[in-house]
Amino acid sequence: QTWYDSLGAINKIQDFLQKQEYKTLEYNLTTTEVVMENVTAFWEEGFGELFEKAKQNNNNRKTSNGDDSLFFSNFSLLGTPVLKDINFKIERGQLLAVAGSTGAGKTSLLMVIMGELEPSEGKIKHSGRISFCSQFSWIMPGTIKENIIFGVSYDEYRYRSVIKACQLEEDISKFAEKDNIVLGEGGITLSGGQRARISLARAVYKDADLYLLDSPFGYLDVLTEKEIFESCVCKLMANKTRILVTSKMEHLKKADKILILHEGSSYFYGTFSELQNLQPDFSSKLMGCDSFDQFSAERRNSILTETLHRFSLEGDAPVSWTETKKQSFKQTGEFGEKRKNSILNPINSIRKFSIVQKTPLQMNGIEEDSDEPLERRLSLVPDSEQGEAILPRISVISTGPTLQARRRQSVLNLMTHSVNQGQNIHRKTTASTRKVSLAPQANLTELDIYSRRLSQETGLEISEEINEEDLKECFFDDMESIPAVTTWNTYLRYITVHKS
């Protein structure tokens, strides 16, 4: 074991020593705008080149029936770009709000801007002075002050302004040592909200031309988030160029430009008023619920994902990468008969039930389009959302056989709060049983009605209670046929967990 550990350490040292010598970067202060033109990117290294070659080969040899797409039938799953033909331009001092479905490529977009992910095609322009706030807040061992200044020269006025805008004054005043209180190893432990605010403060304190804020308000309550968005993002940073990944309507309304991503493509780019004019059905769906912004981030993302899936299927969105033919949104009768009523109606079910998890697939796998009939998926909310989500959400997606398994597994992961990282998707695991509860039907609030909206066209009867065995049947798959695919989500989780 020691020998293997030593080898690992030697390899890491070797990798480090072989890297390009670090040089302090210069900045182009004459570049004021941030531009992205026709950007397409793959997470798999070198995949862009491979894809181009395959495309060329495809042009050279036509298939027997003249259908080019057949050549890509097995290729497209692994070759789906994480970003496809993305365009935007924002001037200095503007706020671009980036929203979109789960796994749509929002974080990947920021990675591309930072140069962490190299596109296979396109153009990116900015001054180079970037500050990034990750959705995963982090703290270094040291004082609060050190964690915020983080090596940047100290400016009292700037520091105080940032502390105030990020609502850290009250937290700091509680400690005898004030902002000299030590965090991390041997120090105090912070709450998730405090960590999030310190991480945001760190990003804001650094002087930059472009601020990339990746869902920075994690763990913050609705009121605090609203206040910090106003005081920090809108006021303190008013003259800075900002790109904010968000799922809040309030943020979209306040943004100068909006970019909505769906499955790696740009579903919409423009202003909020243009969104209302050009995509009235889509925007009214999301704004139809006054309490949309009161939902948890997970719930908002889920609703956004469902809505985008629905509208892209109805042909409102740009054609997806594999250019699937439009299919009816209505569910086939055959599918309704295949599933027992107990699965389709969890509303009356008050009792707890268990779900056997068969495989530890990661959530948010690439979703592939397919010509198979659409199926409705049972999607249950996690325990943490019981208060606001009594009804299960029904998600409508177009999936190939491979992704049916993924989507089912992601539902299981959602139900069981499962976070199994870095495991092989082929491995047959020992079944682990977790308990999930469905809250009883109380009075139907606007939230409940809203959660039904997406499935109002469905012709399914809602009755009985959930039968555990029936549910297990829904999620059974032959895992042998699934190819291994590493997505950005998996990669990001991996580096987050193993960052030491």
Partner: nanobody, 127 residues
Framework: QVQLQESGGGLVQPGGSLRLSCATS????????IGWFRQAPGKEREGVSC????????NYADSVKGRFTIYRDIVKNTIYLQMNSLKPEDTAAYYC????????????????????WGQGTQVTVSS
């Protein structure tokens, strides 16, 4: 204004090698893209190779893949184009171009994407 200065051109026999240099400055070498283009007599200017200077990632035209190598020296602020196995059809005036944007894929081999150009250096491959 970005300054670009090419050098290293000359007369070489088929199968021989040459190394072209493009000296630049400032930001371009950190966040932009440097491209090499060539123009043979009576022909249009075409993209040969390019490099994203922040990451060192590269692209090549099909006609030079495996023979030409573009690389950078961040200390000397210089981009090099190492040309091996030269053929008579490689005879052309070679130009260094720069842009403050990062250009990827086919974008970085397109002339119209570049804002700054050098004066050019002549390469002649002949026996």
């Amino acid at each position: 204004q970005v300054q670009l200065q090419e050098s290293g051109g000359g007369l070489v026999q088929p199968g021989g090698s040459l190394r072209l240099s493009c000296a630049t400055s400032r930001f371009t070498l950190d966040y932009g893209t440097i491209g090499w283009f060539r123009q043979a007599p009576g022909k249009e200017r075409e993209g040969v190779s390019c490099i994203r200077t922040s990451s060192g990632s590269t692209n090549y035209a099909d006609s030079v893949k495996g023979r030409f190598t573009i690389y950078r020296d961040i200390v000397k602020n210089t981009i090099y184009l190492q040309m091996n196995s030269l053929k008579p059809e490689d005879t052309a005036a070679y130009y260094c171009a720069a842009d403050e944007a990062r250009l990827y894929g086919s974008s970085c081999l397109r002339m119209d994407e570049y804002d700054y150009w050098g004066q050019g250096t002549q390469v002649t491959v002949s026996s």
